[in-house]
């Protein structure tokens, strides 16, 4: 059975969050997709969305967020560049399908951004801040002012979470900790 999970990314200020959300190609290829932040007890807030209809491999930039929808592969890529401490929070990808409620994609992302310069001597992480390139053509898309009460949740208490951490040999650049936590709605 498919489990809605939460993955934790711990990054430093200035680094880039680079994630992907997968969707059912046949159903949602050209649907408009959005990146939302979920604050405890509040409605999810849309921060950026693709065009409508969504264009293939066409980067859309809203501030420090870049969305790229790979239609052919059923993947939405989300990049948040030059991360700030205040970007910390719970995020999710959704697909707009009016008049129905937005369709939530797996997985949710728990982003924790901490102070501290990345890539300093002695650091075992490489910063992507000097590496990231802004796509040559970007479009600012208008997002529907629509949120779904159904997706207002709080993460499960730690005591009930079945936490499985990455294999010990994994060393992800720019990611100090990724923890997968099932979310029970």
């Amino acid at each position: 059975a498919t489990k809605l999970t939460e993955e934790k990314y711990e990054l430093k200020e200035g680094q880039t969050l680079d994630v992907k959300c997968d969707y059912t190609l046949e159903k949602f290829a050209s649907s408009q997709k959005a990146w939302q932040i979920i604050r405890d007890g509040e409605m999810p807030k849309t921060l950026a969305c693709t065009e409508r209809p969504s264009k293939n491999s066409h980067p859309v930039q809203v501030g420090r967020i870049i969305l790229e929808d790979y239609h052919d592969h059923g993947l939405l890529r989300v990049r948040m560049v030059n991360l700030q401490v205040e970007d910390s929070g719970l995020y999710q990808c959704v697909i707009y399908q009016p008049p129905k409620e937005p369709h939530m994609l797996f997985d949710r992302i728990r982003l924790v951004v901490t102070k501290g310069f990345s890539g300093t001597p002695g650091s075992n992480e490489n910063s992507t801040q000097n590496v990231y390139k802004i796509p040559p053509t970007t479009t600012k898309a208008l997002c529907p002012l629509y949120t779904s009460p159904r997706t207002v949740t709080q993460a499960p208490p730690k005591s009930t979470a079945d936490v499985s951490t990455p294999d010990s040999e994994i060393n992800l650049t720019n990611v100090t900790d990724i923890i997968r936590v099932p979310v029970f709605n």
Epitope: E7, V19, S57, E68, V131, P166, L172
Partner: antibody, heavy 123, light 107 residues
């Protein structure tokens, strides 16, 4: 430790289909995407596509889109890749591969490889 | 699709030599580049990810550098077990593509 064990070699006639299995162990199967990469004899590596074992969603390159189906059985931690309408140029070793990071990470680094399955297409 | 061009396609060297392989992308791929080693009859093995990060357990004689379109893979002092074929692979966007490979042979 992480292990991906693939099914044995297959010999198929042109026009037939082949289904290669990939049994995962040593990690949480639904937490990491499985990708498929093939290599014709004496040739380079060719990425075919990916599958998220949790959602069941998958995607493949245009070249294979109409002929490839990627599925999984989470109860036995096994991924499958079926290629139909086989032709002689599909003769290759097919590898299932696990990425370095969780399914949500945009990090296509192929860290753990199966031993490969040789598929021979011959009349 | 992004094309990855490796050079040379084959290379003869001796144990102890310093060996360099280059990989050129048809457009800027930032640091989204990996290097693999493959021995005959075996599956490829990830050596370097994100252009310069050494995979856990890989000897430090292997290194990678570069960003944008030009990348370099170096073996500082060739060992007998290093004779193999090496591939670069980008993942700046989808689809993912590999270089055609560089075959490293004993001189």
């Amino acid at each position: 430790q992480v292990q991906l064990v693939q099914s044995g070699a297959e010999v198929k006639k042109p026009g037939a289909s082949v289904k290669v299995s990939c049994k995962a162990s040593g990690y949480t199967f639904t937490s990491y995407d499985i990708n498929w990469v093939r290599q014709a004899t004496g040739q380079g590596l060719e990425w075919m596509g990916w599958m998220n074992p949790n959602s069941g969603n998958s995607g493949s390159v245009k070249k294979f889109r109409d002929r490839v189906t990627m599925t999984r059985d989470t109860s036995i931690s096994t991924a499958y890749m079926e290629l139909s309408s086989l032709r002689s140029e599909d003769t290759a070793v097919y590898y299932c591969v696990r990425l370095i990071g969780y399914s949500s990470a945009y990090k296509w680094s192929f860290q753990h490889w199966g031993q490969g399955t040789l598929v021979t297409v011959s009349s | 699709d992004i094309q990855m061009t490796q050079s040379p396609s084959s290379l003869s060297a001796s144990v102890g030599d310093r060996v360099t392989i280059t990989c050129q992308a048809s457009r800027d791929i930032s640091k989204y580049l990996n290097w693999y080693q493959q021995k005959p009859g075996k599956a490829p093995k990830l050596l370097i990810y994100d252009a310069s990060n050494l995979e856990t357990g890989v000897p430090s004689r292997f290194s990678g550098s570069g960003s944008g379109t030009d990348f370099t893979f170096t073996i500082s002092s060739l060992q007998p077990e290093d004779f193999a074929t090496y591939y670069c692979q980008h993942y700046d966007n989808i689809p993912i593509t590999f270089g055609q490979g560089t075959r490293l042979e004993i001189k």
